[in-house]
Interface confidence: medium
């Protein structure tokens, strides 16, 4: 669908909070992957009954994707070839390059809690160095 993509300001820290904010974002933390391979970025919001209305995925200051409760997924045009939605609210990065190394943020917009932000650091290594076991997979 014709989705107007805004400029993105990456979030940092561990989220904001509503007056009853109890949730926490669980992420994979620091992960590594092979150059040319794929990786799943995954965050999980737990310990809250808040409704998730939207999840943004960003690489530092660039918007990668939006998963909106009403509209579904949108991938930013500049990442369409290498980013796939899911599984779930996660994001799959494909054809990794060394330039993909850096911070990634999941920003959960929830009601009534507010905004929760999770951080993942991805290091893309030459294939002989990457730790295969560091990849995160959804059970």
């Amino acid at each position: 669908y014709p989705y107007d993509v805004p400029d993105y300001a990456g979030g940092g820290g561990s989220g904001g909070g509503g007056s009853m904010m109890t949730g926490t974002i669980e992420t994979t933390g620091n992960i590594s992957a092979e150059k040319g391979g794929s990786i799943i970025l995954q965050c999980h919001l737990s310990s809250t009954t808040a409704q998730v209305t939207q999840v943004n995925w960003a690489q530092q200051d660039q918007l990668l994707a939006i998963c909106n409760a009403d509209l579904g997924w949108h991938i930013s045009p500049s990442f369409k070839d290498r980013v796939a939605p899911g599984p779930g609210l996660g994001l799959t990065l494909q054809s990794l390059t060394v330039n993909d190394t850096g911070e990634y943020f999941c920003i959960y917009h929830t009601y009534p809690d507010g905004t929760y932000t999770g951080r993942i650091f991805l290091e893309v290594l030459e294939s002989s160095v990457a730790e295969h076991g560091a990849r995160f997979q959804i059970p």
């Epitope: 669908y1 014709p2 989705y3 107007d4 993509v5 805004p6 993105y8 300001a9 979030g11 940092g12 820290g13 561990s14 989220g15 904001g16 909070g17 509503g18 904010m21 409704q51 209305t53 943004n56 918007l63 939006i66 909106n68 409760a69 009403d70 509209l71 920003i107 917009h109 009601y111 009534p112 809690d113 507010g114 905004t115 932000t117």
Partner: antibody, heavy 119, light 107 residues
Framework: EVQLVESGGGLVQPGGSLRLSCAAS????????MHWVRQAPGKGLEWVAF????????YYADTVKGRFTISRDNAKNSLYLQMNSLRAEDTAVYYC????????????WGQGTMVTVSS | DIQMTQSPSSLSASVGDRVTITCRAS??????LAWYQQKPGKAPKLLIY???TLQSGVPSRFSGSGSGTDFTLTISSLQPEDFATYYC?????????FGGGTKVEIK
């Protein structure tokens, strides 16, 4: 060019009702959450209500909950605010505003419509 | 609800001056703060969101900083068209709340 045009304001007696409309153009209305924000004469801004792009999420300020109803018709590119049981303190300019796709900041606003509640 | 407190409520400045407006939240809002400019009889205009990101089309003399509870809007060199009222708004949580405004007047 993004345009938001409010209408439906006017003078109403306490306890009365009004329905405000906001006509949107210049963007894909069905992709954006929308807000109503009001401003009493000589005062600051007060958020009133929000509706998500597909109407699945609707939130209200406590001051209007149970009296105001926000709705939208994506086929008509229109946003509405049904205001019932109006009080003098509801007197204000009412603005419709578009929500950014990524955050709950409001990137485009209409010119506003004045609602006066007085006997 | 989160209370947003702006200071000063008004200030007088001259063209070319550096102007700083502060906004304090009653609790942490991470970096999720927006700044708006409003001129008399007009609708507000978004200047900055997410604390420091300039809205498209806004002159670079406007900048925002801060996180947690304390935020600042800076106009590096005040221009004639910048005389207006400025509002902060937290967009971290429901209900979204605004500061009381800062009126920037000509000295």
């Amino acid at each position: 060019e993004v345009q938001l045009v409010e209408s439906g304001g006017g003078l109403v007696q306490p306890g009365g009702s009004l329905r405000l409309s906001c006509a949107a153009s210049g963007f894909t209305f069905s992709n954006f959450g929308m807000h109503w924000v009001r401003q009493a004469p000589g005062k600051g801004l007060e958020w009133v209500a929000f509706i998500s792009s597909g109407s699945s999420s609707i939130y209200y300020a406590d001051t209007v909950k149970g009296r105001f109803t926000i709705s939208r018709d994506n086929a008509k590119n229109s946003l509405y605010l049904q205001m019932n049981s109006l009080r003098a303190e509801d007197t204000a300019v009412y603005y419709c505003a578009r929500m950014r796709l990524d955050y709950y900041a409001m990137d485009y606003w209409g010119q506003g419509t004045m609602v006066t509640v007085s006997s | 609800d989160i209370q947003m407190t702006q200071s000063p409520s008004s200030l007088s400045a001259s063209v070319g001056d550096r102007v700083t407006i502060t906004c304090r939240a009653s609790k942490s809002i991470s970096k999720y703060l927006a700044w708006y400019q409003q001129k008399p009889g007009k609708a507000p205009k978004l200047l900055i969101y997410s604390g420091s990101t300039l809205q498209s089309g806004v002159p670079s003399r406007f900048s925002g900083s801060g996180s947690g509870t304390d935020f600042t809007l800076t106009i590096s060199s005040l221009q004639p068209e910048d005389f207006a009222t400025y509002y902060c708004q937290q967009h971290n949580e429901y209900p979204w709340t605004f500061g009381g405004g800062t009126k920037v007047e000509i000295k």
